[in-house]
């Protein structure tokens, strides 16, 4: 029961996280014009991974895409790559984890297969989250470096008469969305890995021997006691009847209300 809950919660948390990573990647506000200690302008600049935008006080907003690959800073390309890798891994992880969910039955898929798929998706979510966090952190570091560089020579004057105010950029909303989303995906991945441990069957390698007692048609497997893993609801020993591999959790062929988070 707790395994199902952990797995389901891990899936939901990762789903939210990956949606956040996608949102952050698409957002235009990765860096925004620093308004602190600057003359008040009628124009507000902000930049994303794919385009830069200018919002005028009149409400008019103009965005221009970066229609070049070679002309862009290597760091920006690296951030783009990290975010895309994070999205791709996360999407694959989601796909895998859907089939790995304990509450969803696909044919006669064994617990061991589901456990492996859960672990795979968990690892994918962890890597996806790390990619997003790394991407956002690299961009944030780039911003901090540029911020202090532009602060150092903020005013470049001609004989002290004419001043050019350099536009300084600070952290945009997308960075915080990215950090939170990456963290959620990471947490979701860890939960999936934990759920995997609870799903994995730890049976002994004894051969199943059938004892036919008179008047009973029940096949009893001596190796039918599952060792407790300490995870989830599988803390009490459970006998496996009918020669099948189903535990008491799985006797119902329809999902119970407890199978949903």
């Amino acid at each position: 029961m707790a395994v199902t809950a952990c797995q389901g919660l891990g899936f939901v948390v990762s789903l939210i996280g990956i949606a956040g990573i996608i949102a952050a990647t698409c957002m235009d506000q990765w860096s925004t014009q620093d308004l602190y200690n600057n003359p008040v302008t009628a124009v507000f600049n902000y930049q994303g991974l794919w385009r830069s935008c200018v919002r005028e006080s009149s409400g008019f907003t103009e965005c221009r895409g970066y229609f070049t690959l070679l002309g862009l800073p290597a760091m920006l390309q690296a951030v783009r790559a990290l975010m895309i890798v994070g999205i791709v891994l996360g999407a694959i992880g989601l796909l895998v984890s859907i089939f790995a969910l304990k509450c969803i039955r696909i044919g006669s898929m064994e617990d061991s297969a589901k456990a492996n798929m859960t672990l795979t998706s968990g690892i994918m979510f962890i890597v996806s989250g790390l990619c997003a966090i790394a991407g956002v952190s690299v961009f944030a570091n780039m911003l901090v470096t540029n911020f202090w560089m532009s602060t150092a020579n903020m005013y470049t004057g001609m004989g002290g008469m004419v001043q050019t105010v350099q536009t300084r950029y600070t952290f945009g909303a997308a960075l915080f969305v990215g950090w939170v989303a990456g963290g959620l995906t990471l947490i979701g991945g860890v939960m999936m890995c934990i759920a995997c441990r609870g799903l994995a069957p730890e049976e002994t390698n004894y051969k199943a021997v059938s004892y036919h007692a008179s008047g009973h048609s029940v096949a009893y497997k001596p190796g039918g006691f599952k060792a407790s893993t300490g995870f989830g609801s599988n803390t009490k020993n459970k006998k496996i009847y009918d020669g099948g591999a189903r535990t008491e959790d799985e006797v119902q062929s329809y999902p119970s209300k407890h199978d949903y988070v």
Partner: antibody
Framework: QVQLVESGGGVVQPGRSLRLSCAAS????????VYWVRQAPGKGLEWVAV???????NYADALKGRFTISKDNSKSTLYLQMNSLRAEDTAVYYC????????????WGQGTLVTVSS | DIVMTQSPDSLAVSLGERATINCKSS????????????LAWYQQKPGQPPKLLIY???TRESGVPDRFSGSGSGTDFTLTISSLQAEDVAVYYC?????????FGQGTKVEIK
């Protein structure tokens, strides 16, 4: 067509208040910013204030606190509340519409004269 | 506040000749985000409200004759009347549309020589 008509000007004593109105037609105040600009007799143009489409306002530093710009979207009317008037506030007051992109005043009213005199 | 300085204060040009008015701002009016200059030029004839001629430093407002042109970037801007006509006699103002408050230049009076 776009039209701006100012009203409310006149002779007022120093220290008194006056409210100017600007009736806008041919466009909506929810879509465009509108400015007040003044011109003292025989002098150049002086930017006074602006109220943007969203309702945000900006003022000339020297007038902040004494002058208040506002608008009534339903009446399509812009206002300039002028308090503690001084002799140097004597001018023709124009209201002008912002063009939207690249921030310039594309339509102007004919102006209303405010004379501050004792 | 941003100081807008126009030169000359007055200008006398023969009909059909070129008239050039300069405007200098105390800070750059070029926005790095879109590489646009936030400067406008206005024409004011006696007893009339100002009329927008040029915005964005170089874009002519619709209905404005093509003899009027704007140029410059950053802090230095120019309004050029390529062939002065009698109806161009007026006072011309440049305006900062970038920094609040939006300040005007002191104006340049154009007359016929």
């Amino acid at each position: 067509q776009v039209q701006l008509v100012e009203s409310g000007g006149g002779v007022v004593q120093p220290g008194r208040s006056l409210r100017l109105s600007c009736a806008a037609s041919g466009f909506t105040l929810t879509s465009y910013g509108v400015y007040w600009v003044r011109q003292a007799p025989g002098k150049g143009l002086e930017w006074v204030a602006v109220v943007w489409a969203g309702g945000n306002t900006n003022y000339a530093d020297a007038l902040k606190g004494r002058f208040t710009i506002s608008k009534d979207n339903s009446k399509s009317t812009l206002y300039l509340q002028m308090n503690s008037l001084r002799a140097e506030d004597t001018a023709v007051y124009y209201c002008a519409r912002d063009r939207g992109r690249l921030l310039a005043m594309d339509y102007w009213g004919q102006g209303t004269l405010v004379t501050v005199s004792s | 506040d941003i100081v807008m300085t126009q030169s000359p204060d007055s200008l006398a040009v023969s009909l059909g000749e070129r008239a050039t008015i300069n405007c200098k701002s105390s800070q750059s009016l070029l926005n790095s985000g879109n590489q646009k200059n936030y400067l406008a030029w206005y024409q004011q004839k006696p007893g009339q409200p100002p009329k927008l001629l040029i915005y964005g430093a170089s874009t002519r407002e619709s209905g404005v004759p093509d003899r009027f042109s704007g140029s410059g970037s950053g802090t230095d801007f120019t309004l050029t009347i390529s062939s002065l006509q009698a109806e161009d006699v007026a006072v011309y103002y440049c305006q900062n549309d970038y920094f609040f408050p939006f300040t005007f230049g002191q104006g340049t009076k154009v007359e016929i020589k």
